[in-house]
């Protein structure tokens, strides 16, 4: 059976600008090697060109001129002796779009252009994006190697240039960010930020880029307590908060981390295995009681570590008045006043708006004061009779407020009654 000229190659191939494509191809031609065996030369030409003097796009013939614009980019791949005419096209350019034909030459008898089986090449705009590879998860403080590569790209043509951009890269020197690989040591603040790898073919206008959002795992770095959205001051891992007894209190504890830390509140300073009073970041006290003075701890538990903060709660109350009440006794007029407040209040007596301090040098009055817990008691002894109607007042105050009460004492040893006068300092 007589061998014929045959070519098997796909009719059309599409490649994106700047990328590579391999076009598989095989051929046959009539050859009987009885005597001599001249070399086999194969060629790929642009359609419409005259094989005898046109520049080729690819050949295995070292004596034929190759088009400068395809030099190094269009290459024969495979063994032509085994009738392999596969064509590799690298760094495809828009101007490469068009038809190509294959030609075989051997000795004087074999000179044939396969015009019936043309290859149609279409170069389209680059839409392929590079891939950014790295081992996940990224962990704060742990160096990680990232690489950027473009699927479908190859060594052909001018080298690729890379540029990396992103907040996570701020400390890197510019040289580092121009390589296809870089080492990144992520920080907590890099979580959720974008990292972009941009690729460009040197001397070409073709650029493509891929952006990834960094998922950085990190332990809680800070822990903050908010009251109605306002952060409380923190000194040496402790926050101090004075709260009025009976007042409602709602606090939010937050410790940003990734994945989110488990937040819980404990009474006092807990052991590691203590039972929380709240399994969320929210501590809600409907009515603050004096028993709750001392404090609470917010703990943020995370696979990479835990953090806690102590809330020193000081429960205070405004002075509450019992009295004054006065009665006549053997030594004279005896008045008593009791106040309750947190912190314990200071007390003073007034006679007709004049303060009575300590004991009088003439022995006309005597003041005794004592305090136990939140209560303060004071007694006033006035010696001798009353020359006229008298107003006796007692007043208590602490840093949060004051209250006073008074009694009007009438001549004739009876009293008109008591009046309680609340006052703010």
């Amino acid at each position: 059976e007589k061998p014929v000229y045959e070519l098997q190659v796909q009719k059309s191939v599409t490649v994106q600008e700047g990328l590579c494509v391999l076009v598989p191809c095989s051929f046959s031609y009539p050859w009987r090697s009885w005597y001599s065996s001249p070399p086999l030369y194969v060629y790929w030409f642009r359609d419409g060109e005259i094989p005898y003097y046109a520049e080729v796009v690819a050949t295995n013939n070292p004596d034929r001129r190759v088009k400068p614009e395809t030099q190094g980019r269009f290459r024969l791949l495979g063994d032509v002796q085994k009738k392999n005419c596969s064509l590799s096209i690298g760094d495809a350019r828009m101007e490469d779009t068009g038809s190509y034909f294959f030609r075989v030459e051997r000795g004087r008898d074999v000179k044939y252009s396969y015009q019936q089986n043309k290859l149609n090449l279409e170069v389209t705009a680059l839409i392929e994006k590079p891939d950014i590879h790295f081992l996940e998860p990224l962990e704060s403080g742990r160096p990680t190697r990232l690489s950027c590569s473009l699927p479908g790209s190859c060594e052909a043509g001018p080298p690729l240039t890379f540029s990396w951009t992103g907040n996570a890269l701020s400390p890197l020197d510019p040289e580092t960010t121009r390589s296809s690989e870089l080492t990144l040591t992520p920080r907590p603040e890099d979580h959720g930020t974008n990292l972009t790898c941009q690729m460009k073919r040197q001397g070409a206008q073709v650029t493509t880029e891929r952006t990834v959002q960094l998922n950085v795992s990190y332990a809680p770095q800070t822990i903050t307590i908010f009251r109605n959205g306002i952060a409380l001051e923190i000194l040496q891992n402790t926050s101090y908060l004075p709260v009025l007894e009976g007042q409602a209190l709602r606090l939010l504890c937050d410790a940003p981390s990734n994945p989110p830390a488990h937040l819980s509140w404990f009474q006092g300073s807990p052991a590691l295995n203590a039972t929380p009073i709240s399994n969320t970041g929210i501590l809600e006290l409907r009515r603050v009681r004096s028993a709750e003075e001392g404090g609470f701890t917010c703990r943020a538990q995370h696979p990479l570590g835990f953090l806690q903060i102590f809330l020193n709660l000081s429960v205070y109350s405004l002075p509450q008045l019992l009295g004054p009440s006065c009665s006549w006794e053997a030594e004279g007029l005896h008045c008593r006043c009791s106040f309750r407040a947190r912190p314990a209040p200071s007390l003073c007596w007034r006679l007709e708006e004049k303060p009575l301090e300590g004991n009088s040098s003439q022995g006309s009055f005597k003041v005794n004061s004592s305090s136990a817990g939140p209560w303060a008691n004071s007694s006033l002894i006035l010696h001798g009779g009353l020359s006229s109607d008298l107003k006796v007042s007692c007043k208590a105050w602490n840093i949060y407020g004051s209250q006073s009460g008074s009694v009007l004492l009438l001549q004739g040893r009876s009293n008109l009654g008591t009046g309680v006068v609340p006052a703010a300092l």
Epitope: T224, G229, I230, L241, L244, Q247, L252, D254, P256
Partner: antibody, heavy 116, light 107 residues
Framework: QAYLQQSGAELARPGASVKMSCKAS????????MYWVKQRPGQGLEWIGY????????EYNQKFKDKATLTADKSSSTAYMQLISLTSEDSAVYYC?????????WGQGTTLTVSS | DVVMTQSPSSLSASLGERVSLTCRAS??????LNWLQQEPDGTIKRLIS???SLDSGVPKRFSGSRSGSDYSLTISSLESEDFVDYYC?????????FGAGTKLELK
């Protein structure tokens, strides 16, 4: 240094909605609550509410409950406030502010003008 | 809501003078009060937190104190940049409320 950049002035028709933004930089966005404040021309300040970006937890002034919606996008470190059913009463400067135990940081304000 | 009554609403003073602004709380707010400064261009910054803690970078001539339900911001010696607006903010209970403001003017 923490910095809050608010979106530009808005002009809206009565009945319309607007969404203003507050982009945070220079700190970890999710670490601090963001609160919003309204200031009518020549008047004082009114608290609208706050959002905790790390959990999405929000709390509103009852007065603004049906007017404002606070959201936060951690990926872009941006807090948003949407105001609906606008009336001339909503014409004001709106501030976002971040609260921190070491200091508050306020945005420069977004001026909203509601006019037909 | 907690009403913060701020006084005076405006105050004329001279350079180097000592002035005090006051906010009175209608309910107990403990030490949950901040003082803010607003410049004519709208820029706002916190001066004092938790009644008396001076924010970093704030000049030491500013101080905060409390007496019962009265909260004071004192400027010990006025400088030209202090002639702006001041507001108090309580955060003890929701909603947070501000004082109506004090305009400090150069005499």
């Amino acid at each position: 240094q923490a910095y809050l950049q608010q979106s530009g002035a808005e002009l809206a028709r009565p009945g319309a909605s607007v969404k203003m933004s507050c982009k945070a930089s220079g700190y970890t966005f999710s670490s601090y609550t963001m609160y919003w404040v309204k200031q009518r021309p020549g008047q004082g300040l009114e608290w609208i509410g706050y959002i905790n970006p790390s959990s999405g937890y929000t709390e509103y002034n009852q007065k603004f409950k049906d007017k404002a919606t606070l959201t936060a996008d951690k990926s872009s470190s941006t807090a948003y406030m949407q105001l609906i059913s606008l009336t001339s009463e909503d014409s004001a400067v709106y501030y976002c502010a971040r609260s921190d135990s070491k200091g508050d940081y306020w945005g420069q304000g977004t001026t909203l003008t509601v006019s037909s | 809501d907690v009403v913060m009554t701020q006084s005076p609403s405006s105050l004329s003073a001279s350079l180097g003078e000592r002035v005090s602004l006051t906010c009175r709380a209608s309910q107990d707010i403990g030490n949950s009060l901040n003082w803010l400064q607003q410049e004519p261009d709208g820029t706002i910054k916190r001066l004092i937190s938790a009644t008396s803690s001076l924010d970093s970078g704030v000049p030491k001539r500013f101080s905060g104190s409390r007496s019962g339900s009265d909260y004071s911001l004192t400027i010990s010696s006025l400088e030209s940049e202090d002639f702006v607006d001041y507001y108090c903010l309580q955060y003890a209970s929701s909603p947070l409320t501000f004082g109506a403001g004090t305009k400090l003017e150069l005499k």
